[in-house]
């Protein structure tokens, strides 16, 4: 999916009002400096691409993020504010339902959510010095 035509300001508002708090709740008890940055993004569409990948694609050691509160709110925000996003996700959602797993918070998941927090921060960053 190409995130170029999303309403970035509306997505930013959704992040600031709820998604950010859910991410913090998930990470509670973890030091903010515990994980180094291992993924980045270079503009808002790119950030959303990486956020979607880390939130909804199962990875080795962390297969369960898609059912977390922050993930469901992320999905809702993208569905509302990114034209045509919902249609592209129907097949992916059906496949996900088939392989639903027991909810376990592993260290790998904590690291992944830490990277998500970094990507969301970049998505919401103020303009850098423009020189």
């Amino acid at each position: 999916y190409d995130f170029t035509n999303c309403d970035f300001e509306k997505i930013k508002a959704a992040y600031l009002s709820t998604i950010s708090k859910d991410l913090i709740t998930y990470m509670s008890g973890t030091k903010s400096t515990e994980f180094n940055n291992t993924v980045s993004c270079s503009n808002r569409p790119h950030c959303l691409t990486e956020i979607q990948s880390l939130t909804f694609n199962p990875t080795a050691g962390c297969a369960s993020l898609a059912k977390e509160m922050f993930a469901m709110k992320t999905k809702a925000a993208l569905a509302i504010w990114c034209p045509g996003y919902s249609e592209t996700q129907i097949n992916a959602t059906q496949a996900m339902k088939k392989r639903r797993k027991r909810k376990v918070t592993t260290n790998k998941c904590l690291e992944q959510v830490s990277q998500l927090q970094g990507l969301w921060r970049r998505f919401n960053r103020p303009l850098l010095k423009q020189q």
């Epitope: 940055n37 291992t38 993924v39 980045s40 993004c41 270079s42 503009n43 790119h46 990486e50 970049r122 960053r125 850098l128 010095k129 423009q130 020189q131």
Partner: antibody, heavy 122, light 108 residues
């Protein structure tokens, strides 16, 4: 852990070519801008080239423009520097480094390799 | 192209504060990054975006940037701080990375 490892350095005659490689591990390579920076013996750091995270755009220092080519293979997590028409003044340790970018601004180089020595001598 | 100017050397007594400057035209409008390099080693980022510090760098390292001068401040200097320090910016107008000439810090 996050790592950059350079290879391909050595002794080469003036006018000849050399290809340096940088293997990245421990981070999502395709999301970072990548640089080559060099350091002549006893001298300061000199930036050589940068390639965008996607490979779409490339920028070179004037001193290497037209002679050096930076490329990346995001599927293999590798960065390359093809150096042609080498000169004695290209003698240096060559480092690869990563930097996040925002739009067309490259941010700080937060991870560096250990460097590979290139000596251009007849 | 853009030029960054650093003093070749700075000395500090153990426990005292060292200040390393980096000068450039209208430098305050650029994001300045600082690197530490010890002999035979690769550079290490110590301050980025003028004043931010990576999580692995001690709080003794800090930075500021305004007008035509950026400053790296190292408080309570230690023998282990002896190194070369480089400032760096991304010059958007020419799409080039620019490094300062480097400053050798000596802890007396």
């Amino acid at each position: 852990q996050m790592q950059l490892v350079e290879s391909g350095g050595g002794v080469v005659q003036p006018g000849r070519s050399l290809r340096l490689s940088c293997a990245a591990s421990g981070f999502t390579f395709r999301t970072y801008g990548m640089h080559w920076v060099r350091q002549a013996p006893g001298k300061g750091l000199e930036w050589v080239a940068v390639i965008w995270y996607s490979g779409a755009y490339i920028h070179y220092a004037d001193s290497v423009k037209g002679r050096f080519t930076i490329t990346r293979d995001n599927s293999k997590n590798t960065l390359n520097l093809q150096m042609n028409s080498l000169r004695a003044e290209d003698t240096a340790v060559y480092y690869c480094s990563r930097s996040p970018q925002w739009e067309d601004i490259f941010e700080a180089m937060d991870i560096w390799g250990q460097g590979t020595m290139v000596t251009v001598s007849s | 192209s853009y030029v960054l100017t650093q003093p070749p050397s700075v000395s500090v007594a153990p426990g005292q504060t060292a200040r390393i400057t980096c000068g450039g035209n209208n430098l305050g409008s650029y994001s300045v990054h600082w690197y530490q390099q010890k002999p035979g080693q690769a550079p290490v980022l110590v301050v980025y975006d003028d004043s931010d510090r990576p999580s692995w760098i001690p709080e003794r390292f800090s930075g500021s940037n305004s007008g035509n001068t950026a400053t790296l401040t190292i408080s309570r200097g230690e023998a282990g701080d002896e190194a070369d320090y480089y400032c760096q910016v991304w010059d958007m107008s020419s799409s080039l990375v620019v490094f300062g000439g480097g400053t050798k810090l000596t802890v007396l």
